[in-house]
């Protein structure tokens, strides 16, 4: 599989936003790339979001996606929003070179995202 690098640990902001870079070593000159973020909790793997982009163009997730991102060369900057403490887990970056053939696939080792729910503000008298 292709080599895919991502940070081991990221701490989400108090607003529930986490960002990390997913970088892949492309064997050749792909023009169409698909990036998928997977969440692994226990032995279950679920898809968080996915986007296909043409090299040189912006990364576009679906309108209702909790992910946004930008791409630059073989690097994708991913941001996941709306995270809560229960969303803490391992987030895996999957990269597929879709076109031109051949097909290449790479899976990162995952980024452990820690999310801490903010303490509610105390009532003021």
């Amino acid at each position: 599989a292709m080599h895919v690098a991502q940070p081991a640990v990221v701490l989400a902001s108090s607003r529930g936003i986490a960002s990390f870079v997913c970088e892949y070593a492309s064997p050749g000159k792909a023009t169409e790339v698909r990036v998928t973020v997977l969440r692994q909790a226990d032995s279950q793997v679920t898809e968080v979001c996915a986007a296909t982009y043409m090299m040189g163009n912006e990364l576009t997730f679906l309108d209702d996606s909790i992910c946004t991102g930008t791409s630059s060369g073989n690097q994708v900057n991913l941001t996941i929003q709306g995270l809560r403490a229960m969303d803490t887990g391992l987030y895996i970056c999957k990269v597929e070179l879709m076109y031109p053939p051949p097909y290449y696939l790479g899976i990162g080792n995952g980024t452990q995202i820690y999310v801490i729910d903010p303490e509610p503000c105390p009532d003021s008298d």
Epitope: A1, A25, S26, P27, G28, V45, I92, K94, M98, L105
Partner: antibody
Framework: EVQLVESGGGLVQPGGSIRLSCAAS????????MNWVRQAPGKGLEWLAQ??????????YYSASVKGRFTISRDDSKNSVYLQMNSLKTEDTGVYYC??????WGQGTLVTVSS | DIQMTQSPSSLSASVGDRVTITCRTS??????LNWYQRKPGKSPKLLIY???NLASGVSSRFSGSGSGTDYTLTISSLQPEDVATYYC?????????FGSGTKLEIK
């Protein structure tokens, strides 16, 4: 048009050696990982070896059945990949295919190991 | 190495039938699965890549599905020219092994 043309197959005695070649055209050879796959008579497809390209430092990988006996190599200036086969056994008989990361395949070359 | 279990090993179906072939892997391969068709005397032909994507020039009768460890190749309406042996392959591993194959015949 993409073409992969294998050559070098033939009859060889057990314990002998043979070198297969695969000439590629119609695509950017240096951008691709190259593989050898075989099909023995009456058996299924068996992946044998892979050589990656320059961004991957020409890393090589082998199946357990051929490791230590077969060597894969490539010459990007000639758009060619090779399989050096040593210490051949009768069970190495089959049709050998080269493939550009399994998207493009050659027509195959027959290797027969027999005394 | 990741083990590939393909089933059935052979099947016979009628023209127009919907045909399903399955492939199970010993561990999660994250959709890194290809399907091939091999006809006697011909080179293998890539049908499906990345579990669900139809390769260029392949009939839309063929489709792939699955994730994790369980994958399926479906032929929506079997045609005489589909007689062949079909193989799955894991393309995630450094040792991209094939399934044992499914020989498909027409009744």
């Amino acid at each position: 048009e993409v073409q992969l043309v294998e050559s070098g197959g033939g009859l060889v005695q057990p314990g002998g050696s043979i070198r297969l070649s695969c000439a590629a055209s119609g695509f950017t050879f240096s951008d691709n990982w190259m593989n050898w796959v075989r099909q023995a008579p009456g058996k299924g497809l068996e992946w044998l070896a892979q050589i990656r390209n320059k961004p991957y430092n020409y890393e090589t990988y082998y199946s357990a059945s051929v490791k230590g006996r077969f060597t894969i190599s490539r010459d990007d200036s000639k758009n060619s990949v090779y399989l050096q086969m040593n210490s051949l056994k009768t069970e190495d008989t089959g049709v050998y295919y080269c493939t550009a990361q399994f998207a493009y395949w050659g027509q195959g070359t027959l290797v027969t190991v027999s005394s | 190495d990741i083990q590939m279990t393909q089933s059935p090993s052979s099947l016979s179906a009628s023209v127009g039938d919907r045909v399903t072939i399955t492939c199970r892997t010993s561990e999660n391969i994250y959709g890194g699965l290809n399907w091939y068709q091999r006809k006697p005397g011909k080179s293998p032909k890539l049908l499906i890549y990345g579990a669900t994507n139809l390769a260029s020039g392949v009939s839309s009768r063929f489709s792939g599905s699955g994730s994790g460890t369980d994958y399926t190749l479906t032929i929506s309406s079997l045609q005489p020219e589909d007689v062949a042996t079909y193989y799955c392959q894991n393309v995630l591993s450094r040792h991209p092994g094939f399934g044992s194959g499914t020989k498909l015949e027409i009744k």
